[in-house]
């Protein structure tokens, strides 16, 4: 009871002057509050509160539910309390069966005793099951039993308060502990696709998956740099306790070019926030853009291989691809494949494999591709480099020696005179006339060059060499001369191949 010091307000006095009182069920509770400035009695148990404005609290026939704390308050706001136990052998515990705990926090199992003289006040598992090994608790007869540092593993744990009364173990009604998880990480968010490419009028639909320990995770779709509320649909599942998944689907039923932009799926919990974005590009119509991977003018040596390679962007998906040469479509020798297996891939590769090219196979090779909206093509000009071939080497009636050579690039023809029997023809002879014969003909294939010299310039026996050469190689033809008197006579010409 409070001690009184004169001059300053003191708390009320209670009779009987005890901190605790034990009353048998059915007997009277009589409590007197002594204070000149009495205001009220308050009774509290299990979050229930009753008030009485009389200075004497009387309960004629006490019941177990009258167990609790009785507080007398005066006009100065000062108070004194007494705790009354109403001992009822048939009702040892008062219970509030709702039991919730927050992970890592303590929680109170509300089962205060009606008899403080019982022993072994503790918790027990239902149906004789043991409590979790790490479950620690602290009993308090007036409040109940506090479970220390609640774990997730205790969720839906069934338990009883227990006490030994006159040598017998008594159990309370059962409690089911519901554990609210602590958010110990940000939500896990993912998006169905990182980017979307659509044509005007097509539907845009994107799904964000949010995973967390509770459905109390907040999530929303936002458009970057916009406050407009977006329309979303949700689906959610509990994959067991503390394993929650929500799918938030954002839909624009008929996308417009100005819907293009970045959309963010944002989620947060009490730990923090996370987000993931997706990019939408809406085009007014489909497109195809072709990028050659090699120069579109190709020079290749006779007999060698070349690969014509293009990359192209196509949206929507390409429907027809073909390689064409001289109005002929290739049925094999080419392949077409997506640049990546990614679902949103719009980039493709096409390769035409030309093998052991002949001089006659130069020309324009065209790649054509189309989708439902557009067609596109790219041409490669293929030039086959061939060493010169001497087509004709003749002595004309007018005394001219003529050499005609074909090759690519355009051959150059040089003339040499070898006097007598010398093998090396070093003295060069200037031609009288040089003509490119097919300069106005087809743009690919061999170029034909004709060169002539005047044989009257030669006064001695010997050999005339016509040498045709280009970057690839050289070929020679020879004219043998012998003088009989004043007559110049051409011995059969012959050619020598010089690689």
């Amino acid at each position: 009871q409070p001690s009184v010091s004169p001059g300053e307000p003191s708390p009320p006095s209670i009779h009987p002057a005890k901190s605790e009182l034990i009353v048998r069920v059915g007997n009277e509770i009589r409590l007197l509050c002594i204070d000149p400035g009495f205001v009220k009695w308050t009774f509290e148990i299990l979050d229930e509160t009753n008030e009485n404005k009389q200075n004497e609290w009387i309960t004629e026939k006490a019941e177990a539910t009258n167990t609790g704390k009785y507080t007398c308050t005066n006009k100065h706001g000062l108070s004194s309390s007494i705790y009354v136990f109403v001992r009822d052998p048939a009702k040892l515990f008062l219970v509030d069966r709702s039991l919730y705990g927050k992970e890592d926090n303590d929680t109170l199992v509300r089962c205060p005793l009606t008899d403080p003289e019982v022993t072994s006040y503790s918790l027990k598992g239902c149906q004789g099951k043991p409590l979790p090994k790490d479950l620690r608790f602290v009993p308090d007869p007036k409040a109940g039993i506090t479970i220390k540092s609640v774990k997730r593993a205790y969720h839906r744990l069934c338990l009883h308060c227990s006490a030994d009364q006159e040598g017998k173990s008594v159990l309370s009604d059962k409690f089911i502990l519901k554990v609210r998880p602590a958010f110990k990480a940000v939500p896990v968010v993912s998006v169905s696709k990182a980017s979307y490419l659509l044509r005007e009028g097509e539907e845009f639909t994107v799904t964000c998956t949010i995973k967390d320990v509770s459905s109390s995770v907040y999530s929303t779709w936002k458009r970057e740099n916009s406050q407009t509320k977006l329309q979303e649909k949700y689906n959610s599942w509990h994959h067991g306790d503390f394993n929650y998944e929500r799918q938030a689907t954002l839909t624009i039923s008929s996308a417009r070019v100005n819907d293009s932009g970045v959309f963010m799926c944002y989620a947060n919990n009490t730990f923090g926030s996370a987000n993931v974005t997706t990019t939408l590009e809406v085009v007014d119509k489909g497109f195809i853009n072709i990028f050659p991977m090699i120069n579109t003018t190709v020079f290749v040596n006779d007999g060698e291989n070349v690969d014509l390679i293009v990359e192209y962007e196509a949206f929507p998906k390409p429907e027809h691809q073909q390689w064409i040469y001289m109005n002929r479509t290739f049925t094999d020798k080419w392949e077409d494949y997506p640049k990546s297996e990614n679902e949103s891939n719009i980039r493709y590769v096409s390769e035409l494999h030309l093998t052991r090219l002949k001089g006659t196979e130069g020309g324009t090779y065209t790649f054509l591709v189309s989708n439902s909206d557009v067609n596109a093509s790219i041409a490669f000009n293929v030039y086959v480099n061939t060493k010169p071939e001497i087509l004709t080497y003749d002595r004309l009636v007018n005394g001219m020696l003529q050499c005609v050579a074909a090759g690519f690039p355009e051959p150059t023809i040089d003339w040499y005179f070898c006097p007598g029997t010398e093998q090396r023809c070093s003295a060069s002879v200037l031609p009288v006339d040089v003509q490119t014969l097919n300069a106005s003909g087809p743009p690919f294939g061999k170029l034909v060059v004709q060169s002539s010299i005047d044989s009257s310039a030669f006064k001695h026996n010997g050999t005339v060499e016509c040498k045709a050469y280009n970057d690839v190689g050289k070929t020679s033809a020879y004219f043998n001369f012998a003088f009989k008197g004043n007559n110049k006579e051409q011995i059969h010409p012959h050619t020598l191949f010089t690689p």
Epitope: Y100, K102, K178, R180, S214, S216, V217, Y218, H238
Partner: antibody, heavy 119, light 106 residues
């Protein structure tokens, strides 16, 4: 024992809003899941949404998304449900119940609040 | 949403009868199924939670069974106070209730 005490009946005009309260007496209100379930005359039960006050974020049934707002005031142990753009088919008894989120069963119910929407 | 189909929608029985009500989910809900009893003009009352656990204070004549998609509520011996409407409810996804089964006196 804990009780859920709901506000009284309401008569509302179409297009208006209604806000119903649900006060919990005792217990650890902040950790409860408080849900709202409605029942139209002669019909079944329909979950509208719920909230765990300690976490603050409400969950809503897809049907009511954007039209219902559920809040909770931990200081007064009271949950609220506001339904906007009322139409005649919203005439129903609106129950608050403990449970309904994170797989909690509805183990405690309020007595219900009749909301009549009529012009 | 997960659809909950209850059958029958109504049944007539006599005191002492064994009554069985079934509830089928449109997809698996594990054991996240609860049963409620509702009397006219009253709020529903929880009978069974987690498919088979009896709520405190509910008479032992009520029992529940099942998991996945098929569930059953059984009243072993119908009592006069059991005439009411019974609802099942799933809690794995956005909460949905079955359409109800009205148990009437024969």
């Amino acid at each position: 024992q804990v009780q859920l005490v709901q506000s009284g009946a309401e008569v509302k005009k179409p297009g208006s809003s209604v806000k119903v309260s649900c006060k919990a007496s005792g217990g650890t209100f902040s950790l409860y899941a408080i849900s709202w379930v409605r029942q139209a005359p002669g019909q079944g039960l329909e979950w509208m949404g719920g909230i765990i006050p300690a976490f603050g974020t409400a969950n809503y049934a897809q049907k009511f998304q954007g039209r219902v707002t559920i809040t909770a005031d931990e200081s007064t142990s009271t949950a609220y449900m506001e339904l906007s753009s009322l139409r005649s088919e919203d005439t129903a008894v609106y129950y608050c119940a403990r449970g309904g989120l994170d797989t909690d069963e509805f183990d405690l119910w309020g007595r219900g609040t009749l909301v009549t929407v009529s012009s | 949403d997960i659809q909950m189909t209850q059958s029958p929608s109504s049944l007539s029985a006599s005191v002492g009868d064994r009554v069985t009500i079934t509830c089928r989910a449109s997809q698996s809900i594990n054991s996240y199924l609860n049963w409620y009893q509702q009397k006219p003009g009253k709020a529903p009352k929880l009978l069974i939670y987690a498919a088979s656990s009896l709520q405190s204070g509910v008479p032992s004549r009520f029992s529940g069974s099942g998991s996945g998609t098929d569930f059953t509520l059984t009243i072993s011996s119908l009592q006069p106070e059991d005439f009411a409407t019974y609802y099942c409810q799933q809690g794995v996804s956005d909460i949905t209730f079955g359409g109800g089964t009205k148990v009437e006196i024969k």
